[in-house]
């Protein structure tokens, strides 16, 4: 056979779908491989030929379209499964081809298992809803192209393995579930599960996501630093190891680009020349809120370190501030032999 | 005085894993920074790849995050670009840079990768 | 994301003239942007950062402006050597993003 275009196993689409549901799995050439769609190169007379290898083997066979019920069937660019069974996982190809053309590319499917409470090894979405904003809707995921929109089918919503009915303040709205005033107490799994006929069948869609309650814009702020501060004094002898925390409090922004960092004399410390590290930590809280930590820590300060000015920075999108530290060399405790006896007029 | 040297093969093919390592030189280990990679397609603009911080945390363009890894070897003084599954769209000039908070200050002189069967 | 928008794509100017380039942020970016300036074969090299701060070796006749999401580079007397592509990058948010970029030319 003549040289075909092999984009080998596109590893990047871990395709999941449930055992016993329908799937329909589009071929990925055109997605993201070719400049060009199903259309175009249908009427090119080109012609899209699939084939898969079971997990586990290595032999690449035809698919079977001439099952029972048409169980697995090919539309233009997509392929079904009505429903999938579990020995349906393994790695699929689609090939695009005509006598003086050839393309390819294989990706893994993999056909899991939901327990009755939809726990599984499916990899789950997460959606981000702000704390106390007012209403908002999350949307049953990946249900399109399923049944035509003459079809109308029934939607059931659950929250872990709750059906939610009565909930005081998560409402069930077809294919959207409202919530009122999100709470860190909706933090969790939701499942959506869209039945619907089709020739005289049933079938069912099994959709769950995260969510994750995060905090609200309405209440975000620029970053607070709490250390350093005009409370503490750093006070050190030369020789003595100075530490500087920089704590800095950031209010949860989505995608905000959140950066703390020192200069020491206007410098970033890599740019002087004075043995300086600096350790970072970093911890959040339930909504997402974070603190940074970084220690500034020169471990044997000199009279002219103490002299340098050590100013803390932080940037989140809501702002910038900073905060310098006040450091200053300890003055020695007098030596009473000397000092005070003179003190004392002694001779 | 910092300086990046990219490097890597020029050739990838098709649906194979691009790898390409940044040397850096002059590093200090005091800089809590970040390291990045960007693009240019020929003829193209810049496109933003990723960084990863000193700590190893890392942020991706989420156009790429499902095909990219960025890893950093502070004791190889080394930042790593890993780009699976690549298609004939990611053939461009590599660049590795250093972000210290206001922009990329430093950058590597680039390589070029060309994807070809 | 943010999308940075650069105008116009080709600018023609004189040496000696003064030259504007713009930037427009899709969303508020407050003044947490920098501008590149590249030439054919090079990396790019950064001017200006935070919107108006000089990078370190960077004329004077370069400066730069705005906050927000309007945002420009001025260069008051071009110079033979200022001819080249330049972009401009936010750094705000997570992606960073960088616009389509503008080429500066000889008229």
């Known amino acids: 056979s003549e040289r075909c275009d092999d984009w080998g196993l596109d590893t990047m689409r871990q395709i999941q779908v449930f055992e016993d549901e329908p799937a329909r799995i589009k071929c990925p050439l055109f997605e993201h491989f070719l400049k060009f769609n199903y259309s175009t190169a249908h009427s090119a007379g080109l012609t899209l030929i699939w084939y898969w290898t079971r997990q586990d083997r290595d032999l690449e066979e035809p698919i079977n379209f001439r099952l029972p019920e048409n169980r697995i069937s090919k539309e233009k660019d997509v392929l079904w499964f009505r429903p999938t069974l579990l020995n349906d996982t393994g790695n699929y190809t689609c090939m695009l081809r005509n006598t003086t053309y050839c393309s390819k590319v294989a990706f893994p499917l993999e056909v899991v298992q939901k327990d009755s409470c939809f726990n599984s090894p499916m990899k789950l979405p997460v959606h981000k809803l702000y704390i106390e904003y007012g209403i908002q809707r999350i949307t049953c995921p990946n249900v399109d192209g399923y049944f035509p929109s003459s079809v109308k089918p029934t939607i059931t919503w659950y929250m872990g393995c709750y059906k939610i009915q009565n909930f005081n303040n998560v409402i069930p709205e077809g294919m959207n579930l409202s919530f009122l005033i999100a709470l860190i107490s909706n933090n969790g799994n939701y499942t959506c599960v869209v039945t619907y006929p089709e020739n005289g069948r049933t079938f069912h869609l099994t959709r769950t996501l995260t969510v994750k309650v995060v905090g609200s814009p309405k209440n975000a702020v620029p970053p607070v630093i709490h250390s350093p501060n005009d409370h503490v004094v750093y006070e050190k002898e030369p020789g003595e190891e100075l530490l500087i925390p920089c704590t800095v409090y950031f209010s949860f922004l989505m995608d905000s680009r959140n950066e703390v960092w020192w200069t020491i004399d206007g410098k970033k410390p890599d740019d002087i020349t004075i043995d300086v590290t600096i350790n970072e930590s970093i911890s959040h809280s339930r909504t997402e809120d974070e603190t940074r930590t970084q220690i500034l820590s020169i471990k044997k300060v000199t009279s002219e370190d103490l002299k340098r000015s050590y100013v803390c920075h932080a940037r989140s999108a809501k702002g910038e501030v900073a905060k310098a530290a006040k450091v200053k060399q300890k003055v020695p405790a007098p030596r009473y032999t000397v000092e005070l006896a003179c003190g004392f007029g002694a001779t | 005085q910092v300086q990046l040297q990219e490097s890597g093969p020029g050739l990838v093919k098709p649906s194979e894993t691009l790898s390409l390592t940044c040397a850096v030189s002059?590093?200090?280990?005091?800089?809590?920074?970040?390291w990045a990679w960007i693009r240019q397609p020929p003829g193209k603009g810049l496109e933003w790849i990723g960084n990863i911080y000193h700590s190893g945390r890392t942020y991706y363009n989420p156009s790429l995050e499902s095909r990219v890894s960025i890893s950093l070897d502070t004791s190889k003084h080394q930042v790593s670009l890993k780009l699976k599954s690549v298609t004939y769209a990611d053939t461009a000039v590599y660049f590795c840079a250093r972000d210290r908070f206001d922009g990329f200050d430093i950058w590597g002189q680039g390589t070029m990768v060309t994807v070809s069967s | 994301e943010i999308v940075m928008t650069q105008s116009p794509a080709t600018l023609s100017v004189s040496p000696g003239e003064r030259a504007t380039l713009s930037c427009r942020a899709s969303q508020t970016i407050n003044n947490i942007l920098a501008w590149y300036q590249q030439k054919p074969g090079q990396a790019p090299r950064l001017l200006i950062y935070?919107?108006?701060t000089r990078a370190t070796g960077i004329p004077a006749r370069f400066s730069g402006s705005g906050s927000g999401t309007e945002f420009t580079l001025t260069i008051s007397s071009l110079q033979s050597e200022d001819f080249a592509v330049y972009y401009c990058?936010?750094?705000?948010?997570?992606?960073?993003?960088f616009g389509g970029g503008t080429k500066l030319e000889i008229k």
């Open positions: 990058q936010q750094y705000n948010n997570w992606p960073l993003t």
């Open positions: 935070g919107a108006s």
């Open positions: 002059g590093y200090s280990a005091s800089g809590l920074y970040y």
